[in-house]
Interface confidence: low
């Protein structure tokens, strides 16, 4: 198992082997087999199943062994501890990052990693990409950062900073993790956003015309969602008028937090006859189908 910390900060690690809290735990420097003392006056000392670096130094990096002595079995665990120098810039390298959290709810909480190992007191300070969070949307409570009305702009690296108290001395601890926003999908009956219901569009005889129909289907990738055109309740391809074509392919977009598709009907040269036709835009998915009828009139 691996643990890491920053130079001049407190680091507390737990023995990777688990045993009853009553069983004694001994810690050793793995390479020298030298026992680590329990006296608190030492900078590195043992407290039950925990090894404390108060504060940590780069030279403390190495492999530590813990032995849990139970009546019928000794269990040994090994811990690879790496103490890093504080990064000079705000870009926190991957090796100093705790697990990424993914949020899909409008309100979300981020937990400060490893805080439970420490004797800490509120408040915990939170930073995003090294800037202190002061907006009222961000609230620190216990070991959590609550974010209200989460958006993609809230993605980034969040650092919590708190104080560990030991023997009347306070030590700083910081921990960083990434937060990414995962859109929560929802599906719904299609909504045609354009053109409006029973819309009449002005065109010029002899000139080309394009009618775009856009429909939205919820959020996420929508199974077999489609936008189609019909002329006088007949599919464009069967209508038998080469001047009128439905554009190939899907034009995908996002609007008001919803996924939408657009299909364009193109008339190469509008004729008088076209003014008497009904043009239906159909939006369909597994919830059902909706139809908006469009008519043309001379400009």
């Amino acid at each position: 198992k691996s643990s890491w910390g920053l130079e001049n900060e407190a680091l507390i690690v737990r023995c990777p082997q688990r045993g009853r809290s009553t069983y004694p735990v001994e810690w050793y420097y793995s390479d020298t087999n030298e026992s680590i003392p329990t006296q608190k006056r030492n900078r590195i000392f043992v407290s039950r199943d925990r090894l404390k670096f108060l504060p940590a130094r780069v030279e403390d990096s190495g492999i530590y062994a813990c032995v849990i002595r139970s009546p019928n079995l000794n269990k040994t665990g090994y811990l690879n501890v790496t103490i890093h120098k504080k990064p000079p810039s705000c870009n926190i390298p991957d090796y100093l990052m705790y697990s990424t959290v993914r949020g899909s709810d409008k309100n979300f909480k981020i937990t400060c990693p490893t805080i439970d190992l420490y004797n800490w007191t509120a408040p915990v300070q939170w930073f995003k990409n090294c800037k202190a969070l002061q907006e009222p949307r961000f609230r620190a409570h216990r070991s959590y950062l609550f974010i209200d009305n989460v958006t993609h702009d809230d993605e980034g690296d969040y650092t919590c900073q708190f104080t560990h108290a030991e023997n009347g001395t306070n030590y700083i601890v910081t921990a960083t993790r990434s937060f990414t926003v995962e859109e929560k999908g929802f599906s719904m009956f299609p909504v045609i956003t354009n053109p409006p219901y029973n819309h009449t569009m002005e065109v010029e005889i002899g000139k080309p015309a394009s009618i775009a129909c856009s429909a939205c289907f919820g959020k996420g990738s929508h199974f077999l969602a489609d936008v189609l055109w019909q002329i006088n309740k007949t599919v464009v391809g069967n209508f038998g008028e080469a001047r009128i074509q439905e554009e190939e392919g899907r034009n995908e977009s996002s609007s008001n937090d919803m996924d939408c598709l657009t299909s364009v009907l193109r008339i190469t040269g509008v004729t008088e006859k076209d003014l008497s036709l009904e043009y239906d835009c159909l939006a369909l998915n597994l919830h059902g189908m909706i139809r908006h009828t469009i008519r043309l009139r001379r400009k």
Epitope: K219, H222, F223
Partner: antibody, heavy 116, light 107 residues
Framework: EVQLVQSGAEVKKPGESLKISCKGS????????IGWVRQMPGKGLEWMGI????????RYSPSFQGQVTISADKSISTAYLQWSSLKASDTAMYYC?????????WGQGTLVTVSS | EIVLTQSPATLSLSPGERATLSCRAS??????LAWYQQKPGQAPRLLIY???NRATGIPARFSGSGSGTDFTLTISSLEPEDFAVYYC?????????FGQGTKVEIK
């Protein structure tokens, strides 16, 4: 890489219950439809029903309504197909499918054999 | 429900030949129609959606046409890996339905 991994083959007796699974990975599970398709031995494909894990909207084909239950547990990105009382005629290969726009991903199939 | 009828049931052709598969719907499905390929022991694979749009990664020798009630899948020049069963599927009305399949076999 998007993957749908289905649970292993099952051999059951008539009247027994069964729940088979389909675990999605490599994509946002709550944002895509998952459908179940039956293929009886030597026969064609039949849509059984579909679920949208984002809001648990479920729709069944009339022939399968009341015969099976489709559900999903988004916390473990898994969709399920279950029977409360199997019949010999339920013997088939069952596929789960995730289809969105131009992409399609299918599970490897779960063979269910019901025999006394 | 909308019934899809595929023809022929079996098509015996040689590699390099042109394959034309037909799918007829019992009522108009506009162009909300997809084609799938299935090889023995494998899951189906989407070839064409919206009647004529090739899915990602599908070779140009596969093309779809038609709208309303009559649809065609054409394989311009059969490759050895194209011998399989082909299904059409409509998604215009619920329930979604498949045709019974056309088997393309080596002559």
């Amino acid at each position: 890489e998007v993957q749908l991994v289905q649970s292993g083959a099952e051999v059951k007796k008539p009247g027994e219950s069964l729940k088979i699974s389909c675990k999605g990975s490599g994509y946002s599970f709550t944002s895509y439809w998952i459908g179940w398709v039956r293929q009886m031995p030597g026969k064609g494909l039949e849509w059984m029903g579909i679920i949208y894990p984002g809001d648990s909207y479920t729709r069944y084909s009339p022939s399968f309504q009341g015969q099976v239950t489709i559900s999903a547990d988004k916390s473990i990105s898994t969709a399920y197909l279950q029977w409360s009382s199997l019949k010999a005629s339920d013997t088939a290969m069952y596929y789960c499918a995730r289809i969105g726009g131009m992409f399609d991903y299918w599970g490897q199939g779960t063979l269910v054999t019901v025999s006394s | 429900e909308i019934v899809l009828t595929q023809s022929p049931a079996t098509l015996s052709l040689s590699p390099g030949e042109r394959a034309t598969l037909s799918c007829r719907a019992s009522q108009s499905v506009a162009n909300a129609l997809a084609w799938y390929q299935q090889k023995p022991g494998q899951a189906p694979r989407l070839l064409i959606y919206k009647a004529s749009n090739r899915a990602t990664g599908i070779p140009a020798r596969f093309s779809g046409s038609g709208s309303g009630t009559d649809f065609t899948l054409t394989i311009s020049s059969l490759e050895p890996e194209d011998f399989a069963v082909y299904y059409c599927q409509q998604y215009y009305g619920w329930p979604i339905t498949f045709g019974q399949g056309t088997k393309v076999e080596i002559k």
